[in-house]
């Protein structure tokens, strides 16, 4: 006799208004009497419609929450698993049931903002900037909303960057406990003459940090050939162990690059009689602290003062 189990009921994908953080929820299946005491597990698969791979979750809960790219549609499917002690060790699964979440097609794609860029400056404040859609009327203006776990609801930007009295960016400060989790952004727009397509972005703040450049550079030469370079980590909240550095050394007309995770470096001079010996350095957040980062600007150049040439007094 083949054992069968029903799929979950009322599977749906819900948008609670958190800019891409969606709820996938369902109700238990109708279970026949002999399986009433059995543990039910649910196998949930979901993805953005353009993705070639599904995310798979096994859970006993009736809801699952995750972040999605709302620029694209979402599809999910779910089935019931009966625990093996209820089925004499055989695997019993229901058929799949499916649900989808379609994106709003309000407004043409040409009205959506372009070139959205966000940088988290020195792990302290976030600046996002964008360009208006390709074909928009002159009365079009844009509004930015953001949400991350810990906020009760999505918030609107309170400090817009403007060009010709139009919002072209936003600065966010005091983002408490906002890193190491998905940060969701929606930029929507309004015009009296046409609907504007919304644009969604999701990232993690620690991966888009642009630090201040290193400071207090110092260079010295020991034994006439050993170059010793030192610098200080920039001020701010980033722990020193989170930096990686790129150094450019200039010896007369020759320049070369080096890299380190420490804030000093020793190298050999290429030529004993070089008259010009300078270096500058930049930094970014390293792999210990984030998956990615943005290089700082280059520091000021620091040169060795110790050389005394034939024209020196």
């Amino acid at each position: 006799l083949e054992i069968k189990v029903n799929p979950p009921q009322d599977f749906e994908i819900l948008d609670p208004g958190l800019l891409g953080y969606l709820y996938l929820q369902w109700k238990p299946p109708v279970v026949i009497e002999k399986f009433k005491g059995c543990t039910l597990e649910y196998e949930l698969k979901y993805r953005n419609v353009d993705s070639d791979s599904w995310k798979t979750i096994i859970t006993r809960n009736l809801i699952y929450k995750d972040g999605f790219d709302l620029n694209k549609g979402i599809e999910g499917k779910i089935r019931t698993h009966l625990s093996e002690h209820c089925t004499n060790g055989s695997e019993v699964q229901s058929p799949w049931i499916e649900a989808s979440y379609g994106i709003s097609d309000e407004g043409s794609l040409e009205t959506k903002i372009q070139d959205m860029k966000c940088i988290y400056y020195n792990w302290q404040y976030l600046v996002c900037s964008w360009k208006p859609g390709k074909t928009v009327y002159s009365d079009t203006n844009y509004t930015m909303f953001f949400w991350y776990e810990g906020l009760d609801h999505a918030l609107q930007c309170a400090d817009y960057l403007q060009h010709d009295e139009k919002n072209v960016g936003c600065k966010l400060s005091n983002l408490d406990s906002s890193d190491y989790k998905d940060f969701f952004i929606c930029v929507n727009g309004s015009s009296k003459l046409e609907p504007i397509r919304s644009s969604y972005t999701v990232f993690q703040l620690q991966n888009i940090v642009k630090p201040l450049p290193p400071e207090f550079l110092h260079i010295s030469v020991e034994n006439s050939i050993d170059i010793r370079m030192k610098w200080s980590t920039p001020g701010g909240p980033i722990p020193p162990r989170c930096y990686t550095y790129e150094i450019v050394i200039r010896e007369d007309d020759i320049s070369w690059e080096s890299a380190t995770d420490k804030n000093d470096m020793k190298l050999k001079r290429r030529a004993n009689e070089s008259e010009d010996l300078c270096f500058f350095v930049r930094c970014k957040v390293n792999i210990y602290c984030a998956d990615d980062g943005i290089w700082s600007e280059w520091s000021e150049e620091e040169c060795w003062e110790g050389y005394t040439g034939p024209d020196s007094k």
């Epitope: 190491y180 210990y288 984030a290 980062g293």
Partner: antibody, heavy 121, light 106 residues
Framework: EVQLLESGGGLVQPGGSLRLSCAAS????????MSWVRQAPGKGLEWVSA????????YYADSVKGRFTISRDNSKNTLYLQMNSLRAEDTAVYYC??????????????WGQGTLVTVSS | DIQMTQSPSSLSASVGDRVTITCRAS??????LNWYQQKPGKAPKLLIY???SLQSGVPSRFSGSGSGTDFTLTISSLQPEDFATYYC????????FGQGTKLEIK
């Protein structure tokens, strides 16, 4: 579900070269730093190399610096390890691993099944 | 470079036992320490990160503690599936592993 599948291992002579690949699926590959970790037969784990999500930063253990090159092709969801000037002591199972991050720290949260590299004459 | 030393190298215990494995760093690594479990022929599996945070899906009988240079992994009541090799790993500077502790059935 997150999957990492290594390939490219095999037998190679000392001084030879080999390129390992790691095909990733089930997550947004370009958003994660990735790493290679190896394990010599009957021995412990040794971190080899790492690369940031965009590929812009790379890191190497001293034991492989100058001989191995890590790279990634985010359009193909694939991580690579080019191994040159191979030595007998490079013989190991090579694992591809994904970084997870917490407040100013990291760990390897997903691992592939490994591919065996044997360097012998 | 930072060295990680685990003790003991091997350990025999019985189902239901409480087991503690220690890991010592050659310099202070704050709480930047992770623990992994590896079974023969399989890839390592993350158990604990940041010295004491339990990875999602890992049974609560596993716990970690310590900071600075001395750390411990505790299994409160050994289960048959826990017999494996355990590794600590620091991520304070580069990424070094301990030599492993093999946990065997007594």
């Amino acid at each position: 579900e997150v999957q990492l599948l290594e390939s490219g291992g095999g037998l190679v002579q000392p001084g030879g070269s080999l390129r390992l690949s790691c095909a990733a699926s089930g997550f947004t590959f370009s958003s994660y730093a990735m790493s290679w970790v190896r394990q010599a037969p009957g021995k412990g784990l040794e971190w080899v190399s790492a690369i940031s999500g965009s590929g812009g930063s790379t890191y190497y253990a001293d034991s492989v610096k100058g001989r191995f090159t890590i790279s990634r092709d985010n359009s193909k969801n694939t991580l690579y390890l080019q191994m040159n000037s191979l030595r007998a002591e490079d013989t190991a199972v090579y694992y591809c691993a994904r970084y997870g991050h917490y407040a100013y720290g990291s760990y390897f949260d997903y691992w592939g099944q490994g591919t065996l590299v044997t360097v012998s004459s | 470079d930072i060295q990680m030393t685990q003790s003991p190298s091997s350990l025999s215990a019985s189902v239901g036992d409480r087991v503690t494995i220690t890991c010592r760093a050659s310099q202070s690594i704050s709480s930047y320490l992770n623990w992994y479990q590896q079974k023969p022929g399989k890839a390592p599996k993350l158990l604990i990160y940041a010295a004491s945070s339990l990875q999602s899906g890992v049974p609560s009988r596993f716990s970690g503690s310590g900071s600075g240079t001395d750390f411990t992994l505790t299994i409160s009541s050994l289960q048959p599936e826990d017999f494996a090799t355990y590794y600590c790993q620091q991520d304070y500077y580069l990424f070094t592993f301990g030599q492993g502790t093999k946990l065997e059935i007594k």
